[in-house]
């Protein structure tokens, strides 16, 4: 969450027993009652809020899907971190899924790159060192990758 | 009687300033969030600005630096001070009682900023 | 900021008609949506607050639905009053997000 156009810069130390609102907000952890007054918590493992706010609610904890693992899990103050499982990767324009990583190397390039769960093998032209990007090759041109990345 | 009446407005030049009324009766502000909205003529609402209860305010992007919101509790009334005005403020500004959850219940009946040379 | 998108920007209709207009809000602000009716002259009046809850002295043919990121409004028998404008604004998150209103609905006379 972005807090924007906020005014009072000082915020007070976040305290364990907070009930009322400082300077109009609430701190990480809680959000604002519908009258304004008081500062209700979050409820662990459902929802956070990481800012501070005036949001009248929690935001919803992020569920890991299937072909994800949870590298955190949600807290009243940060959401759940979920990361591809390996031998998949989570491109930058395509945030909503996990793809199975390229096995190998179009022939005639080499892998300099290995699968991460950001990013797929980066595969460069031996002569030029030229990067390739792109969909994966067809098998019979497919250069096998090392024993140590997985397999789609 | 609820109500909230504006005052204040009128003609100003470019790079002037004026500062906006708005008197209370009927309740105490001092219990409530308060906020400012602006209406260009043949336009749409705009929200200028809000203070808290606890008289933090805060400001649309465009609002900062040049508008503040403050509040007399003691005299009910709220204000809006506007520095370096331009041909775009030119507006009818609203005041109303900001209730949270429950949204903008009560409104002014506006004053009008015309900024012109 | 949120930003809310509403549509249509016009619409033009019959006395009696069924009328829905349209919010979207940029991301989730659960049930906090108040919907406002104005005239020409006049500030705007309060119709709708909590996505579908009727403020106080308003006509049971206005009625509200939605909740996340996507509303309604509907008016199921449009009355010759209701010629006017009609916005959206969020309530939650005000000073975290602002309150940036939608940018009407103007319901004219066919």
């Known amino acids: 969450i972005t807090q924007q156009d906020l005014a009072p810069q000082q915020r007070a130390a976040p305290q364990q027993k907070r009930s009322s609102p400082s300077e109009g907000l609430c701190p990480p952890g809680h959000h604002i009652s519908e009258d304004g007054r008081d500062c209700i918590s979050c409820k662990y493992g459902q929802d956070y809020s990481t800012h501070w706010n005036d949001l009248l609610f929690c935001l919803r904890c992020t569920r890991c899907d299937s072909g994800e693992v949870e590298l955190s899990p949600c807290t009243t103050t940060r959401n759940t971190v979920c990361q591809c499982e390996e031998g998949t990767f989570r491109e930058e324009d395509s945030p909503e899924m996990c793809r199975k990583c390229r096995t190998g190397c179009p022939r005639g390039m080499v892998k300099v790159g290995d699968c991460t769960p950001w990013s797929d093998i980066e595969c460069v032209h031996k002569e030029s060192g030229t990067k390739h990007s792109g969909e994966a090759p067809a098998v019979e041109e497919t250069v096998t990758s090392s024993p140590g990345t997985p397999a789609s | 009687q609820v109500q909230l009446v504006e005052s204040g407005g009128g003609l100003v030049q470019p790079g002037g300033s004026l500062r906006l009324s708005c008197s209370a009766s009927?309740?105490?502000?001092?219990?409530?969030?308060m906020i400012w909205v602006r209406q260009a003529p043949g336009k749409g609402l705009e929200y200028v600005g809000f203070?808290?209860?606890?008289?933090?305010?805060y400001y649309a992007s465009w609002a900062k630096g040049r508008f503040t919101i403050s509040r007399d509790n003691s005299k009910n009334t709220l204000y809006l001070q506007m520095n370096s005005l331009r041909a775009e403020d030119t507006a009818v500004y609203y005041c109303?009682?900001?209730?949270?959850?429950?949204?903008?219940?009560?409104w002014g009946q506006g004053t009008l900023v015309t900024v012109s040379s | 900021d949120i930003q809310m998108t509403q549509s249509p920007s016009s619409l033009s209709a019959s006395v009696g008609d069924r009328v829905t207009i349209t919010c979207r809000a940029s991301?989730?602000?659960?049930?906090?949506l108040s919907w406002y009716q104005q005239k020409p002259g006049q500030p705007p009046k309060r119709l709708i607050y909590?996505?579908?809850t009727l403020a106080s002295g308003v006509p049971s043919r206005f009625s509200g639905s939605g909740s996340g990121t996507d509303f309604t409004l509907t008016i199921s028998s449009l009355q010759p009053e209701d010629f006017a404008t009609y916005y959206c604004?969020?309530?939650?998150?005000?000073?975290?997000?602002?309150?940036?209103f939608g940018g009407g609905t103007k319901v004219e006379i066919k």
């Open positions: 203070i808290t209860s606890d008289s933090s305010a």
């Open positions: 109303a009682r900001y209730t949270y959850s429950d949204g903008t219940d009560l």
């Open positions: 604004q969020p309530n939650s998150g005000i000073a975290t997000y602002g309150a940036a």
């Open positions: 991301q989730s602000i659960s049930t906090y």
């Open positions: 909590k996505a579908s």
């Open positions: 009927g309740f105490s502000i001092s219990r409530y969030a």
